[in-house]
């Protein structure tokens, strides 16, 4: 069978080979399409409801004024010339519709390096057959499930027109130190060959590089955190971040009911002050970050104090942002 590709809504003429150019003609067309249950026979006499869909022209060709999805299928013509020689024509008709230019919607203006980000959603409406959407970074195709790239796809079919709407959501994890202004685009590739891809306008989000948090330092005076009864201990929380975060204090894992301050003074130390202390710096952009823990202890006269405070666990570390 000869393959014929026709655009939806356009007229289509199929030649009946070997048919006399004008009546009288001995020919018949047989159709097996989405409109027929089995084979439908059409003759030059025509007439009836089929004339609006397909009719035989005076020269024996079959004319479809506006091809639709239901016209996909097999078309056969059997003709006999004046000498009684029989000729058969066989066509396989496929239809297509090129959608409008695809678009990127819900596009991100900023991405964060090192974490997955939604870049945007590519939408193509009105294609047949469905076709495919693919994403590009600086003109080169992005491959899902490679190098921090993931794609969520959805295909819907219009209940009346039968045309397809495709959606593709792109997630990427930009590398640290990469291009600060990557250029993303999306393209629609038709399901039928010989038609070039349609590409969206590009988008160019900024990539924000989160500054790695420097550690919160807890300095103890006297060094080691061991002090005689009635002595004074000064705990200082040093945070290099700007602007200065709020500093709260913890004792034995419980927040102390004190106003925020980078310095905690424990005057006239008594047994009740012994324990493990840490400070928590709360950044507006990064969330809370806890220092190492230090142990404050009382030494009786004549005892050797430890040269350094015993260090507890690493605390909360940096809490991930939701």
């Amino acid at each position: 069978a000869q393959n014929i590709t026709a655009r939806i809504g356009e007229p289509l003429v199929l030649k009946c080979k070997g048919a006399p150019k004008k009546p009288p003609q001995r020919l018949e067309w047989k159709l097996n399409t989405g409109r027929t249950e089995a084979w439908k026979v059409l003759s030059p006499q025509g007439g009836g409801p089929w004339d609006s869909v397909a009719r035989v022209l005076p020269n024996g060709s079959l004319f479809l004024p506006a091809v639709g999805i239901q016209d996909e299928g097999i078309f056969r013509c059997q003709a006999m010339n004046r000498n009684g020689k029989e000729t058969k024509s066989n066509y396989r008709v496929r239809v297509y519709q090129i959608p409008g230019k695809p678009e990127i919607v819900d596009s991100a203006s900023e991405l964060t390096a090192g974490v997955p980000n939604k870049v945007g959603t590519c939408v193509s409406e009105g294609s047949y057959p469905a076709g495919t959407l693919s994403w590009h970074l600086d003109g080169k195709p992005l491959v899902p499930n490679e190098k921090g790239v993931s794609v969520k796809e959805q295909t819907r079919r219009h209940p009346e027109t039968g045309l397809f709407t495709l959606q593709s959501e792109l997630m990427v994890t930009p590398a640290r130190g990469g291009d600060p202004r990557p250029t993303f685009s999306c393209s629609f590739s038709p399901g039928l060959p010989r038609h070039r891809a349609l590409r969206t306008a590009p988008i160019q989000p900024r990539v924000w590089e989160p500054v790695p948090l420097e550690e919160v330092q807890l300095v103890v005076e006297p060094e080691g955190g061991a002090v005689a009864p009635g002595g004074t201990v000064t705990l200082t929380c040093e945070v290099p971040a700007q602007p200065s975060p709020q500093i709260h204090w913890m004792k034995d894992g419980v927040p102390l009911p004190l106003p925020p301050s980078p310095v905690l003074i424990l005057p006239e130390i008594g047994p009740q002050d012994q324990g493990t202390y840490s400070c928590v710096a709360t950044h507006s952009s990064h969330g809370p970050q806890e220092s190492r823990a230090v142990s404050i202890s009382i030494i009786e006269p004549g005892e050797e104090g430890p040269t350094a405070g015993s260090v507890g666990g690493s605390g909360l570390g940096t809490l991930a942002l939701a």
Partner: antibody
Framework: QVQLQQSGPELVKPGASVRISCKAS????????IHWVKQRPGQGLEWIGW????????KYNEKFKGKATLTADKSSSTAYMQLSSLTSEDSAVYFC???????????WGQGTSVTVSS | DIVMSQSPSSLAVSVGEKVTMSCKSS????????????LAWYQQKPGQSLKLLIY???TRESGVPDRFAGSGSGTDFTLTISSVKAEDLAVYYC?????????FGGGTKLEIK
Amino acid sequence: QVQLQQSGPELVKPGASVRISCKASGYTFTDYYIHWVKQRPGQGLEWIGWIYPGNVITKYNEKFKGKATLTADKSSSTAYMQLSSLTSEDSAVYFCARYDYDYAMDYWGQGTSVTVSS
Amino acid sequence: DIVMSQSPSSLAVSVGEKVTMSCKSSQTLLYSSNQKNYLAWYQQKPGQSLKLLIYWASTRESGVPDRFAGSGSGTDFTLTISSVKAEDLAVYYCQQYFGYPYTFGGGTKLEIK
């Protein structure tokens, strides 16, 4: 047929600015990138950057950031390149070219000669 | 930046001869995901603009005579003119569009003996 028509030659003084135009015809201006390329005698070809007229997104060669500014006017299907703080190093022929990700720089303007001299 | 090197810088041939010119890149121009080489060849005739001859390293632009052929992959590329004509007198440039900034080779000047 596709055509890119560039503005005429420019003679400018050091320190001044110049704006070169590139008028597109024969295709949908907003669907293709316009790239700009510099050619100095004996220095070969240097890529300056691109603009996508559909949404006026740009990409520059780091070397030309601050030197070249790319703009586009959809209504007249014209792309522009402004060159600022000109020195003798900027004396060159500047080309605009239509670019398609699938076909590279498939159509070029005829070039605009810029001479920087006091 | 990707450095593009062309050789020879010039060559003189007689009409009808076969010509090959080389273009090497400092890093691969082959993108593994689609197995395409992001390399183009351009022709610049004296006093004229540039004309695209080849893209994807080996695909001939429509309207370009079939005596022009591009080949190669990765970092080594070749432009071949199977039978030179007098009108082929020009400078031929290769260009990578694999990564920013896009870069061009220094050109090969073809002269006719």
